[in-house]
């Protein structure tokens, strides 16, 4: 390419920056353990970390977890992207009565226009069914005159809504205008949890939240409650709990109305890519080659790369690199690229901790 | 030194099949993808295929779906592009590169490139 060679050129002598044949451009070389966000980076700000799948990277710089949309009556909404959470909704039929961060914390059925009624707006996942009286004048559904009371100024009759949470059973039913009640199918075996805060009977100001306890007269001591799994976070929202179910994890601590629960890697493994509340990736203790030691790289698909150790260090089997993260894998074999320069080796410092636990604890 | 070394071009008549490889030596920095491109006499550089490296993902250029592979041997350090039912549209420089996956994209950086190896496809 002679017409390239001046561009070339200028990224010469320049450890920084290197020069892509395929778009004709220098481009910034992100740091070991970065990763572009762009085909050519530009400058520092192009480089992020790299989280495991179903993590994604927040506004902090955290490997943060993916909400799942694994409830029966969620369904994904948006993926979880590198840098942004899987968002869930109600799946369609229902709407979201006590939202989440990215998620909903209870769904409930659409309400079905009672008699006389019609729809004015039909139910999103976002919000419940508006109803209107089917005609201005007295509905002709109406068995007699004095069944028929139009609505006070101002108010649009709304059959109450059926609430659904994780729980399963068969179908519900309500009370609704005038005493006749009205049954719901669910589509999937939903209803109610029977230890739900929330009844259809008993006033709520806020759906899906109640009291932890019942209020003392005269006290504000009422404060929000989440539904099963999620907790009350330092913004006041519900927050799905993390899940310690991957076969690496322990629970560490539960999952409490304000705080999360906390995963660590189970025993004989450790913590190689942080998250909130958990761990990304765990591994194995290393066990080291006579003469081998690995070569930390935070990199999306888990390559390792394998070299000497520096001379007069002995492998200690149990290394911390300068990060603080171990190393991603001991097996050689997820890597196509191999150092075969003994004098590029990382210095690993044989007295640093060896972190445990991720949760910053 | 970084250095990509291709191999296994050379002259082969339409309809028949080439293997190239690419060794790499030295450390790759960060590198978790390779893929091969190509330029044809006069014409600008074409990206042909690529893999990810750790997950063995790979992705073709529509040109050579179906008719080129690509794989790797991780014990040899070797990256590999075999190609079959070749065309005189597929006479061209065949390089390799190495780089990084781009985040939230199957596209990667190519940040260390071979010298190349010339394949002619004639009768």
């Known amino acids: 390419f002679p017409q390239d060679r001046p561009f070339e050129d200028t990224c010469h002598g320049n450890p920084s920056h290197y020069y892509d044949k395929a778009v004709r451009r220098c481009c910034y070389r992100c740091p070991m353990g970065l990763f572009p966000t762009q085909q050519c980076p530009q400058r520092p700000t192009d480089c992020r970390k790299q989280c495991e799948p179903d993590y994604y990277l927040d506004e902090a710089d955290r490997c943060t977890a993916c909400v799942t949309c694994s409830r029966d009556d969620l369904v994904e909404k948006t993926p979880c992207a590198w840098n942004s959470s899987r968002v869930c909704e109600c799946r369609p039929g229902m709407f979201c009565s006590t939202s989440a961060v990215n998620s909903c914390a209870r769904c409930f059925f659409h309400s079905v226009c009672p008699a006389g009624m019609i729809v004015k707006f039909p139910g999103t996942a976002q919000k419940n069914t508006v109803c209107e009286p089917a005609s201005p004048g007295v509905s002709p559904a109406c068995a007699s005159p004095e069944n028929c009371k139009e609505p006070s100024s101002g108010t649009i009759p709304q059959a109450k809504p059926t609430p659904v949470s994780p729980a399963t059973s068969s179908a519900s039913t309500m009370p609704v205008r005038g005493g006749t009640r009205l049954a719901q199918e669910a589509a999937s075996k939903l209803t109610r949890a029977p230890d739900s805060p929330s009844s259809v009977g008993r006033p709520s100001s806020d759906p899906g939240l109640s009291p932890t306890q019942p209020c003392p007269e005269g006290s504000g001591d009422c404060r929000k409650q989440c539904e099963p799994d999620y907790y009350l976070d330092e913004a006041g929202r519900c927050t799905a709990c993390v899940s310690c179910s991957r076969d690496d994890l322990v629970e560490k601590t539960p999952c409490a109305w304000n705080s999360s629960r906390t995963c660590e890697c189970r025993p004989g493994m450790i913590c190689a890519t942080s998250a909130t509340n958990s761990c990304a990736r765990c591994v194995p203790y290393p066990i080291c080659a006579a003469e081998t030691v690995t070569k930390p790289q935070d990199m999306a698909e888990k390559d390792t790369t394998f070299e000497a150790p520096p001379l007069g260090t002995q492998p200690d089997c149990n290394p911390t690199p300068e990060n603080g993260e171990a190393p991603a894998s001991t097996s050689p074999t997820q890597s196509l690229l191999v150092d075969s320069q003994a004098s590029k080796t990382l210095p690993i410092p044989t007295s640093a901790p060896v972190a445990l636990s991720s949760t910053g604890k | 030194e970084v250095q990509l070394v291709e191999s296994g071009g050379g002259l082969v008549q339409p309809g028949g099949s080439l293997r190239l490889s690419c060794a790499a030596s030295g450390y790759i920095y960060s590198s978790n993808c390779m893929g091969w491109f190509r330029q044809a006499p006069g014409k600008g550089l074409e990206w042909v295929a690529r893999?990810?490296?750790?997950?063995?993902?790979?992705y073709y250029a529509d040109s050579v779906k179906g008719r080129f592979t690509i794989s790797q041997d991780n014990s040899k350090n070797t990256l590999y592009l075999q190609m079959n039912s070749l065309r005189a549209e597929d006479t061209a420089v065949y390089y390799c590169?190495?780089?990084?996956?781009?985040?939230?994209?199957?596209?990667?950086?190519?940040?260390?490139w071979g010298q190349g190896t010339l394949v002619t496809v004639s009768s």
């Open positions: 893999i990810h490296t750790g997950s063995g993902s790979t």
């Open positions: 590169a190495a780089g990084r996956v781009v985040l939230g994209a199957v596209v990667c950086t190519n940040e260390y």
